[in-house]
């Protein structure tokens, strides 16, 4: 049913879904704090622009009686229940922030006539791609896939002279929400990644992974997995690894690699870590002090969601345009706005662009070092270390298939 929006006459409200099922186990209080900090910034920016309006947030909590798994498995209905709650109360803001689970976002998008924008900190799965009124402020699976294909094909760097066309993917079903959807996208037979690779096998058992490390008959030297170094250690331990194995560890939302005095453990020497470039001020800002390095990005996405709304509100008000229109709902894409920690760019489909960073472990210094960066906006790789102090022979990444010569 059509719900009237609390979104006119100088008063603009943001509906924030505070769901029990969330992409990251972040206390809702921290998300509230992030939203409130964002509101303060937005009010200041609007005031500076001479716009005398009120901006508030309404936090919509689910009762948690039915949907209490805490992760995303039972989120599908929780999102719809919250929308029903909003509908019954006849209280919808100009914009909806949350949900973060792919299941709930997909279902809410499917089952509602969305004439308002939806901003998500999460919704990583491919099923949430190309949604006209959905904006995602954390890197979705599609962006990861494009990096991997780009990197696999690269063969003109001093440290990577072979194109790769094969891979193992380790996916055992215990992954976090972000990893679940990232690996899901790599596994999907119809995805861009699968389409571009000649060989790809999913390893589902710990033993399968462990066996591959020294298997002379393996079909690929490259293994993709998702999680932190501890996750890898639990799986790999101190087992011997063939010298031409390359493990790509996807750990996007983890700033720990960049903290002072971090030393890479020995078991990381065969590993390239794919993570996101950390914000400069975030490393010691008051906002992030109480958050773990992994959860910083999640709370930051909520905060940036508020700033994005403020940015769009300012533009529409300055142009004398109506906020409760399809034009406003479809406007949250193909733009750059001032985020909490610098400019944030959204692509044509409302998905955040970022700089991904591929790290290696220096055998000289036992420190993580940047091998290359990748700009998701232009799908381009920028090498940083032309002769890395790798564990691999001749400071070069091996071929993906043992014994295959130059291509």
């Amino acid at each position: 049913s059509q719900v009237s929006q609390n979104c006119h006459n100088g008063s603009y409200e943001i509906s924030v879904l505070m769901m029990g099922n969330s992409a990251f186990a972040e206390p809702l209080k921290n998300l509230e704090d992030a939203v409130n900090e964002g509101l303060e910034i937005v009010r200041g920016r609007l005031q500076n622009a001479g716009l005398n309006v009120t901006v508030n947030a309404t936090f919509m909590y689910s009762d948690g009686l039915i949907h209490n798994s805490g992760d995303c498995r039972s989120s599908t209905c929780e999102g719809l229940d919250l929308l029903r709650k909003i509908s019954n109360a006849q209280r919808m803001g100009c914009v909806l922030i949350g949900p973060s689970c792919t299941y709930s976002t997909f279902q809410m998008y499917l089952d509602t006539e969305l004439s308002y924008p939806m901003i998500s900190a999460g919704s990583f799965g491919l099923s949430c791609d190309y949604k006209e009124t959905l904006t995602r402020l954390m890197s979705p699976a599609r962006k990861l896939m494009y990096f991997l294909v780009n990197f696999w094909k690269t063969n003109d760097l001093p440290f990577k002279t072979y194109s790769w066309s094969t891979s193992y993917v380790y996916k055992n079903g215990t992954e976090t929400e972000d990893c679940f959807w990232y690996l899901n996208a790599l596994e999907a037979s119809v995805s861009y990644f699968s389409h571009e690779l000649g060989f790809k096998v999913v390893l589902r058992q710990d033993k399968e992974f462990q066996d591959i490390l020294m298997d002379h008959n393996r079909k690929s030297n490259v293994i993709i997995m998702c999680g932190g170094p501890e996750f890898l250690y639990k799986l790999k331990g101190d087992r011997a690894v063939a010298e031409d194995i390359v493990i790509i560890l996807v750990d996007l939302f983890n700033d720990q690699y960049f903290e002072d005095n971090v030393t890479a453990p020995d078991y990381m020497k065969n590993v390239l870590v794919l993570t996101l470039s950390p914000g400069n001020s975030l490393l010691n800002s008051s906002f992030s002090r109480n958050l773990s390095p992994t959860k910083r990005d999640f709370a930051l996405a909520y905060l940036n969601g508020i700033l994005l709304f403020g940015h769009m509100l300012k533009i529409f008000l300055e142009n004398g345009e109506n906020i409760t229109t399809p034009k406003f709902a479809h406007a949250f894409r193909n733009l750059t706005f001032e985020g909490y920690d610098g400019p944030v760019t959204l692509d044509d489909w409302g998905d955040v662009d970022s700089t991904m960073v591929l790290l290696y472990t220096s055998v000289d210094t036992k420190k993580y070092k940047v091998l290359l960066t990748y700009d998701t906006h232009v799908n381009k790789t920028y090498p940083v270390d032309m002769s890395p102090t790798f564990t691999w022979k001749n400071s070069k990444l091996p071929n993906d298939i043992t014994g295959r010569g130059p291509q």
């Epitope: 005095n261 490393l283 210094t365 420190k367 940083v384």
Partner: nanobody, 127 residues
Framework: QKQLVESGGGLVQPGGSLRLSCAAS????????IGWFRQAPGKEREGVSC???????NYADSVKGRFTLFRASAENTVYLQMNSLKPEDTAVYYC?????????????????????WGQGTLVTVSS
């Protein structure tokens, strides 16, 4: 004091390219933040670009998109690739190092942040 040696300068036509290198003896350069500076005749020394210990780079607005800074860790060298050179790029180019994990490479390198300097290499852009 760390011994830094710059090389690769010379005379080049506008629109041309040069690659400067900064090498260190007896020190592992990738343990430090490296800054490149330049000083044109009669002008203050200014920051051009830097690379932090972990490998993040930053550039002055005047050189963004034209200059690229990268490492060659195994050679213990840092390179400054300069493309689309302009007459106003004419200067003596210096490299400098400082410890500290982040130092000022998130921002433009400031002179006072760097403790060891090379002798400089002259770049002249002229037709």
């Amino acid at each position: 004091q760390k011994q830094l040696v710059e090389s690769g300068g010379g005379l080049v036509q506008p629109g041309g390219s040069l690659r400067l290198s900064c090498a260190a003896s007896g020190e592992t350069l990738s343990n430090y933040n490296i800054g490149w500076f330049r000083q044109a005749p009669g002008k203050e020394r200014e920051g051009v670009s830097c690379i932090s210990q972990i490998g993040f780079t930053n550039y002055a607005d005047s050189v963004k998109g034209r200059f690229t800074l990268f490492r060659a860790s195994a050679e213990n060298t840092v390179y400054l690739q300069m493309n689309s050179l302009k007459p106003e790029d004419t200067a003596v180019y210096y490299c400098a190092v400082t410890g500290g994990r982040w130092a000022s490479c998130s921002f433009l390198p400031l002179r006072q942040d760097f403790e060891s300097w090379g002798q400089g290499t002259l770049v002249t852009v002229s037709s």
